[in-house]
């Protein structure tokens, strides 16, 4: 009988045993146990990864596969030798014994062995293919790595070169900036010197202009005087001719001509034929007391007596009651004509008041009151106004009914405070009210949010301080 059995030896190798009669044939075959299972990431017929494996792992795997192949090759060679040896022995026995059925058994064994060999060969072929596939992939990966490395090296070199270029450029620019700074400092210094020179020049020119203005004023006054003298001489000649006839009429004529020379206001000056704007001497009504006033002979037909002007902040308007009474400043510039003169004048006949305003943005506006007068000092020069027209607000910025005049030393306002002290300047304050054209003079860009500035509420609001103002009066019947 024959019996075919498969088992394991002590080291776990597969044994193929054939029992035939008293003869027992044992074959120890090599196995690929050193190859990893299909769960291992290294099995080549498993699903291939997208990302390449680590280079060191790939090399290690190649070494493992090579050792397995060598192992298998050695086993195959041993097996072949073993088969050849056994076949020889068997052939001798068959020939010696000439037993027919032994031949059949040997053929069966041979067939089995051939099948096993074929199976082993197929497995080895598979392993070889896997190794080849893995080797090819590793070569490709190595090539990719090499290319990538070369590319990176090139990029690094390019960047290094670029950095060097930029550093050179930066150094150049830094040098340029430093040079420019030096030039700039020199330029600034020269500009500063120029500015100082210009300032000196401007102040000189200002002095010259002021001197010329004084000369012009003097010339104007002289011109007026000359005109008067000419007029007087003509009249004197005429008087002398008349005097020859009658001495009594001559006296009357002289007195009349003397009266004609005095001017009560700028309307009188204008009517006399003096139509050039400038400073003229005016005489108080019913008095010989005189005051100098600026006459505006151009605005709206001329004949305007200027009673206030602000234009540059050159005159301090925080003055006493007495100063506001008699007047202060320069009639050709910033000034207050004087409350006493204006009160006396406006109580003689009906006058209109025109207030001309200018802001810092180049805008102009005016308020015209068709009836204006001041009470006497006894009533604190209280202001009286009627009939407002004009562009500086539909509502009067001088409180109605009119208020008494207040100064820093005469508090006649309606406030618990002293408006003149709070807002500065003398004015017809209420409590303290919507206007104060005698407030602090603020220059451009400092003229907003100034509650003690030159204020005309119904044109520019609470905190706006104006650039220039003029107050002028003229008889209503002019």
């Amino acid at each position: 009988y024959s019996n075919f059995r498969k088992s394991m030896d002590s080291v776990g190798r597969k044994q193929y045993q054939v029992q035939h009669g008293s003869c027992s044939y044992t074959f120890l075959l090599p196995e690929t146990d050193n190859c990893r299972s299909s769960s291992s990431p290294y099995v080549s017929n498993a699903v291939q990864r997208d990302a390449p494996l680590d280079y060191d792992d790939s090399v290690h795997r190649l070494q493992v596969l090579e050792s397995i192949m060598e192992n298998n090759t050695q086993w195959l060679m041993k097996l072949e030798n073993y088969i050849q040896d056994n076949m020889k022995k068997e052939m001798v026995e068959i020939q010696q014994n000439a037993v027919q059925n032994q031949t059949a058994v040997m053929i069966e064994i041979g067939t089995n062995l051939l099948n096993q060999t074929a199976e082993q060969t197929r497995k080895l072929t598979d392993v070889e293919a896997q190794v080849l596939n893995q080797t090819t992939r590793l070569e490709l990966q190595l090539l990719e790595h090499s290319l990538s490395t070369n590319k990176l090296e090139k990029q690094i070199l390019d960047q290094t070169s670029e950095i060097n270029k930029l550093q050179d450029k930066n150094s150049f620019l830094e040098k340029k900036v430093l040079d420019m700074e030096d030039k700039h400092i020199v330029q600034l210094q020269s500009i500063k010197e120029e500015k100082d020179q210009l300032q000196v020049l401007v102040s000189k020119q200002n002095s010259i202009i002021e001197e010329l203005e004084r000369q012009l004023v003097t010339a104007t006054v002289n011109n007026s005087a000359l005109q008067k003298q000419q007029h007087d001489l003509t009249e004197t000649v005429h008087s002398l001719l008349t005097m020859i006839a009658t001495s009594s009429s001559a006296k009357n004529s002289f007195a009349a001509k003397e009266e004609q020379i005095t001017f009560r206001d700028c309307a009188d000056v204008f009517r006399s034929g003096l139509t050039t704007s400038g400073i003229y001497t005016l005489t108080f009504p019913n008095s010989t007391e005189e005051t100098k006033a600026y006459c505006d002979m151009e605005t709206g037909g001329g004949g305007w007596t200027t009673i206030q002007r602000r234009e540059d902040g050159s005159v301090d308007f925080q003055r006493t009651w007495k100063e506001y009474k008699v007047g202060f400043g320069n009639p050709s510039g910033e000034h207050w004509l004087g409350n006493e003169f204006v009160s006396q004048l406006t109580n003689q006949q009906r006058y209109v008041l025109k207030i001309h305003l200018r802001d810092w943005e180049g805008n102009e506006a005016y308020s015209l009151y068709e009836h204006f007068y001041l009470s006497s000092e006894e009533f604190n020069y209280r202001i009286h106004l009627k009939g407002l027209t004009g562009t500086a607000g539909k509502i009067s910025s001088i409180s109605q009914p009119g208020n008494d005049f207040s100064t820093k030393d005469a508090d006649n306002d309606k406030c618990i405070c002293k408006c003149s002290q709070m807002l500065t300047g003398g004015w017809w304050f209420d409590a303290c009210g919507p206007s104060n054209l005698n407030g602090m003079y603020y220059p451009q860009r400092q003229n907003t949010n100034k509650f003690n500035g030159i204020k005309w509420y119904y044109w520019k609001g609470s905190g706006y301080s104006l650039k220039a103002t003029t107050m002028m009066i003229r008889p209503a019947d002019f």
Epitope: C417, M422, A431, P434, Y457, S462
Partner: antibody, heavy 121, light 107 residues
Framework: QVQLVQSGAEVKKPGSSVKVSCKAS????????MVWVRQAPGQCLEWMGY????????GYNQKFEGRVTITADESTSTAYMELSSLRSEDTAVYYC??????????????WGQGTLVTVSS | DIVMTQSPDSLAVSLGERATINCKAS??????VAWYQQKPGQPPKLLIY???TRDTGVPDRFSGSGSGTDFTLTISSLQAEDVAVYYC?????????FGCGTKVEIK
């Protein structure tokens, strides 16, 4: 009676803007200036600016210049204060208040109830 | 800006006793000073203006004085309802500024 009613509390992110309203009643809205004052936690009262509702004239504390805008709507008797580019230190109670005088920004006789503005990221 | 410095920061006074709060301006503000009372969770309330004038409805136990740079608010007889923070405020010069407050408590 004279009353100023302000809008409700606001929580804002840094860099954003807030607009607080103040509705006046019981008096002629255009007869008095309106001011805005703020009070940060543990800080002094700070005057921010004013508006004259009669002519829309405004004035601002230089500290807030460029960030604060005060407006008024005569038709609804409402004043508004908008503060932009908010920072955490703008967290405060914001008050509107009426000045006693139209012509001058002096003392403040009527105050709103206040609006808490919290600036937090 | 004009700085208004209040003193003391806090003040504890017995009921019926006098409480005095001082305020010093960094420059002359004439009499353009107001005083406000602020109770917790409420807006400030005007008490005094023009340094010494009581606003309508303010009890006469509150009085103000001073001019120039030194100002005082006096509560002649402290009442429980007077517990609050008191602020001085100058409006003489732009921008108007406030003191940082004096807390009045009952001892």
């Amino acid at each position: 009676q004279v009353q100023l009613v302000q809008s409700g509390a606001e929580v804002k992110k840094p860099g954003s803007s807030v607009k607080v309203s103040c509705k006046a009643s019981g008096y002629s809205f255009t007869d008095y200036n309106m001011v805005w004052v703020r009070q940060a936690p543990g800080q002094c009262l700070e005057w921010m600016g004013y508006i004259d509702p009669y002519n829309g004239g405004t004035g601002y504390n230089q500290k807030f210049e460029g960030r604060v805008t005060i407006t008024a709507d005569e038709s609804t008797s409402t004043a508004y204060m908008e503060l932009s580019s908010l920072r955490s230190e703008d967290t405060a109670v914001y008050y509107c208040a009426r000045t006693r005088d139209r012509y001058d920004v002096w003392y403040f006789d009527v105050w709103g109830q206040g609006t808490l503005v919290t600036v937090s990221s | 800006d004009i700085v208004m410095t209040q003193s003391p920061d806090s003040l504890a006074v017995s009921l019926g006793e006098r409480a005095t709060i001082n305020c010093k301006a960094s420059q002359d503000v004439y009499i353009a000073v107001a005083w406000y009372q602020q109770k917790p969770g409420q807006p400030p309330k005007l008490l005094i203006y023009w340094a010494s004038t009581r606003d309508t409805g303010v009890p006469d136990r509150f009085s103000g004085s001073g001019s120039g740079t030194d100002f005082t608010l006096t509560i002649s007889s402290l009442q429980a309802e007077d517990v609050a923070v008191y602020y001085c405020h100058q409006y003489s010069s732009y921008p108007p500024t406030f003191g940082c407050g004096t807390k009045v408590e009952i001892k």
